[in-house]
Interface confidence: low
């Protein structure tokens, strides 16, 4: 999906008002210095590409993020403010349904959400200092 057509300011507002708080809630009890940020992004469309990938694509050791509150709100924001985004997510939704129903917060998931927090912060001030 080409995220260059999204309404970035509206997505930013959604992040600041709710998604950021849900990410903090998910990470509660974890030290902010526990994980190093290894994923970065250079422009807001690029940031959204990375955010979508980390939020909705199951990874080894963390298959359940898509059902979290921050993920559902992220999906809603992208669906509302990125034209045509919903249509591209039909296959992704099917994959999400196959994901395990129980929410398991593994260390790998915590690390992944820590990366997401960094990506969202970069989304708000996105210019990569050095490619």
């Amino acid at each position: 999906y080409d995220f260059t057509n999204c309404d970035f300011e509206k997505i930013k507002a959604a992040y600041l008002s709710t998604i950021s708080k849900d990410l903090i809630t998910y990470m509660s009890g974890t030290k902010s210095t526990e994980f190093n940020n290894t994923v970065s992004c250079s422009n807001r469309p690029h940031c959204l590409t990375e955010i979508q990938s980390l939020t909705f694509n199951p990874t080894a050791g963390c298959a359940s993020l898509a059902k979290e509150m921050f993920a559902m709100k992220t999906k809603a924001a992208l669906a509302i403010w990125c034209p045509g985004y919903s249509e591209t997510q039909i296959n992704a939704t099917q994959a999400m349904k196959k994901a395990r129903k129980s929410k398991v917060t593994t260390n790998k998931c915590l690390e992944q959400v820590s990366q997401l927090q960094g990506l969202w912060r970069r989304f708000n001030r996105p210019l990569l200092k050095q490619q």
Epitope: T4, N43, P126, L127, K129, Q131
Partner: antibody, heavy 117, light 107 residues
Framework: EVQLVQSGAEVKKPGASVKVSCKAS????????MHWVRQAPGQGLEWMGM????????TLIQKFKDRVTMTVDKSTSTAYMELSSLRSEDTAVYYC??????????WGQGTTVTVSS | DIQMTQSPSSLSASVGDRVTITCRAS??????LAWYQQKPGKAPKLLIY???TLAEGVPSRFSGSVSGTDFTLTISSLQPEDFATYYC?????????FGGGTKVEIK
């Protein structure tokens, strides 16, 4: 209204330094990066580097690394670009421009720097 | 560094003409390209960013498109105020680089 107002024209001798200022208004200074671009007479645009006003981190292209210093004064929302060891080929119009995603939505009016003995 | 090759370097056209300027990137920059218009003695003015998004206040006769690493700026019907020099610039990552410029002159 967003404005970037630059300092006036300068005439300098070879080997001297020049410091160009760029005063920002109409937006939150620390939210946007400030870039500097120069244009020699009759030539195209050349990117020099950028500074992040929130933490003063700078990125400069290799050719300017030894001669350019970029700074900001957050209290006055002003960015500065100092170019040292001036030579005749530094004669150009110097622009500041703000950016969030890498394209420049607002530019300063330009500062003409003439290097002549 | 990413090189931006802009063509033509100059062109002559009449009011009402359709004008096309192209810019080729030396590597994939996706949609991270901006177009600017510059008039003598003035700072450049943003026309288009993300290859095809029109900047605020820019007339709809300006449009941008992308095909791979080739980018196009089109002026559908040239107006007297459009005679100027146009630059492309990639905004994919540092160092930012500009094309050499295209001067649009009156025929």
């Amino acid at each position: 209204e967003v404005q970037l107002v630059q300092s006036g024209a300068e005439v300098k001798k070879p080997g001297a330094s020049v410091k160009v200022s760029c005063k920002a208004s109409g937006y939150t200074f620390t939210t946007y990066w400030m870039h500097w671009v120069r244009q020699a007479p009759g030539q195209g645009l050349e990117w020099m580097g950028m500074i992040d006003p929130s933490d003063s981190e700078t990125t400069l292209i290799q050719k300017f690394k030894d001669r350019v210093t970029m700074t900001v004064d957050k209290s006055t929302s002003t960015a500065y670009m100092e170019l040292s060891s001036l030579r005749s080929e530094d004669t150009a119009v110097y622009y500041c421009a703000r950016t969030l995603d890498g394209y420049y939505d607002y530019w300063g009016q330009g500062t003409t720097v003439t290097v002549s003995s | 560094d990413i090189q931006m090759t802009q063509s033509p370097s100059s062109l002559s056209a009449s009011v009402g003409d359709r004008v096309t300027i192209t810019c080729r990137a030396s590597e994939n920059i996706y949609s991270y390209l901006a177009w600017y218009q510059q008039k003598p003695g003035k700072a450049p003015k943003l026309l288009i960013y993300f290859a095809k998004t029109l900047a605020e206040g820019v007339p709809s006769r300006f449009s941008g498109s992308v095909s791979g690493t080739d980018f196009t700026l089109t002026i559908s019907s040239l107006q007297p105020e459009d005679f100027a020099t146009y630059y492309c610039q990639h905004h994919y990552g540092t160092p930012w680089t500009f094309g050499g410029g295209t001067k649009v002159e009156i025929k």
